[in-house]
């Protein structure tokens, strides 16, 4: 089932999924001045069975002013510029998310998309969060927030994560560890059945990254 | 909760312009797309176009392209569509929608255009 | 852009029977992406399902949708009082967004 909504605003923080469950859609979007080409995918869908998941369509723009030329490849170092980062790029790669049953890794880039990547996604899905440069994280709890389904109806846990406005950048998903796990976070509504899933693997997982490249920023 | 309330009801005269809006409260608004669809009177459903407030690029159906211009406030969550050289047969209820199937909608605004 | 074309345009049952709605595309839409909404005279269209075959939020369990290519079905299961009403498919897998004609499903 999709998330009825994005994830919550944290003030000066980016997230940032490090695998798309099974069901997430992402919206095929092109920068000014380009459009998808005829006829071409809305979205891109993460499907799979069992043993592999990957992402059904593809996202192709092609230039406004032209009708005939349609591109998909990887973009130009100053191209990929014009995405929204965190600026904390690493060469260090991110861990094989295809490892990661029923699950998407991050789809390449397409030629001239759009400056900021639109997900929609389902239950389940955890995304981290992390302050942007400037800004050092005080974390209370779990930096990370996952869609629940409770009383019929989807939202998402509040990420506890504080950034304040001092010159040292922290580290990805945090400096410090967590004070609560995922599982002994506060929930307002305990009488009815919640539910959640990927906890426990999508937290090993992150403890094992150290830096990721952050698409969407906080508005 | 998720609402999405348009403007109220207007009446125009042919060749003129009428723009309509659509605020959002209670749920994403910027990052997900903003349909605007009409239906003529006894009439079924019809897409004009669509935009993704953050982005601020709209997408438009063909026979409304140079007539139609949509817009996105994203500090007042407020989306808005503007049909310019109105005629009869744009007499309508014209409704806004969330994301690209729909999951809320505007209660509706309906356009009269008579001479 | 992909037509959509739905059947029958009129469908009369009484409460309690079961209603099968169809929406046939003039090509594959893919992935699936394809939604039914119910409209009552007077009200906005409402969400019934997506993807198909996901039911939305708050949508009672004898709406069900299935299908995949070109060929989709609504199918509500007993008929209740208020299920009355015009339905629609509309797909968007590519754009334009486009619109079956309706189905019309009467009391009998």
């Known amino acids: 089932e999709l998330c009825d909504d994005d994830p919550p605003e944290i003030p000066h923080a980016t997230f940032k999924a490090m695998a798309y469950k099974e069901g997430t859609m992402l919206n095929c979007e092109c920068k000014r001045g380009f459009r998808r080409i005829k006829s071409g995918s809305l979205y891109m869908l993460c499907t799979g069975n069992s043993s592999h998941s990957s992402w059904d369509n593809q996202c192709q723009c092609t230039s406004s002013a032209t009708r005939n030329t349609t591109k998909q490849v990887t973009p130009q170092p100053e191209e990929q510029k014009e995405r929204k980062t965190t600026e904390m790029q690493s060469p260090m790669q991110p861990v094989d998310q295809a490892s990661l049953p029923g699950h998407c890794r991050e789809p390449p880039p397409w030629e001239n998309e759009a400056t900021e990547r639109i997900y929609h996604f389902v239950v389940g899905q955890m995304v981290y969060y992390q302050c942007v440069q400037g800004y050092r994280a005080l974390h209370r709890g779990p930096a990370e927030s996952v869609c629940k389904m409770t009383h019929g109806k989807t939202r998402w846990t509040q990420p506890q994560l504080i950034c304040t406005g001092e010159m040292e950048t922290s580290q990805f998903p945090g400096e410090e560890k967590p004070q609560a796990s995922p599982e002994g976070r506060p929930e307002s509504e305990t009488s009815c059945l919640v539910t959640t899933t990927d906890f426990q693997i999508q937290t090993e997982m992150a403890a094992t990254m150290e830096t990721s490249i952050f698409t969407t920023e906080y508005q | 909760q998720v609402q999405l309330v348009q403007s109220g009801a207007e009446v125009k005269k042919p060749g003129s312009s009428v723009k309509v809006s659509c605020k959002a409260s209670g749920g994403t608004f910027s990052r997900y797309p903003i349909n605007w669809v009409r239906q003529a009177p006894g009439q079924g459903l019809e897409w004009m176009g669509r935009?993704?407030?953050?982005?601020?690029?709209?997408d438009y159906a063909q026979r409304f392209q140079g007539r139609v211009t949509i817009t996105a406030d994203k500090f007042t969550n407020t989306a808005y569509m503007e049909l310019s050289s109105l005629r009869s047969e744009d007499t309508a209820v014209y409704y806004c929608a969330r994301r690209d199937w729909g999951d809320y909608w505007g209660q509706g605004t309906l356009v009269t255009v008579s001479s | 852009e992909i037509v959509l074309t739905q059947s029958p345009g009129t469908l009369s049952l009484s409460p309690g029977e079961r209603a099968t709605l169809s929406c046939r595309a003039s090509?594959?839409?893919?992935?699936?992406?394809l939604a039914w909404y119910q409209q009552k005279p007077g009200q906005a269209p409402r969400l019934l399902i997506y993807?198909?075959?996901s039911r939305a939020t708050g949508i009672p369990d004898r709406f069900s949708g299935s299908g995949s290519g070109t060929d989709f079905t609504l199918t509500i299961s007993r008929l209740e009082p208020e299920d009355f009403a015009v339905y629609y498919c509309q797909q968007y897998s590519s754009s334009p967004l486009t619109f079956g004609g309706g189905t019309k499903v009467e009391i009998k």
């Open positions: 090509q594959s839409v893919s992935s699936s992406f």
């Open positions: 935009i993704i407030p953050i982005l601020g690029i709209a």
């Open positions: 993807g198909a075959s």
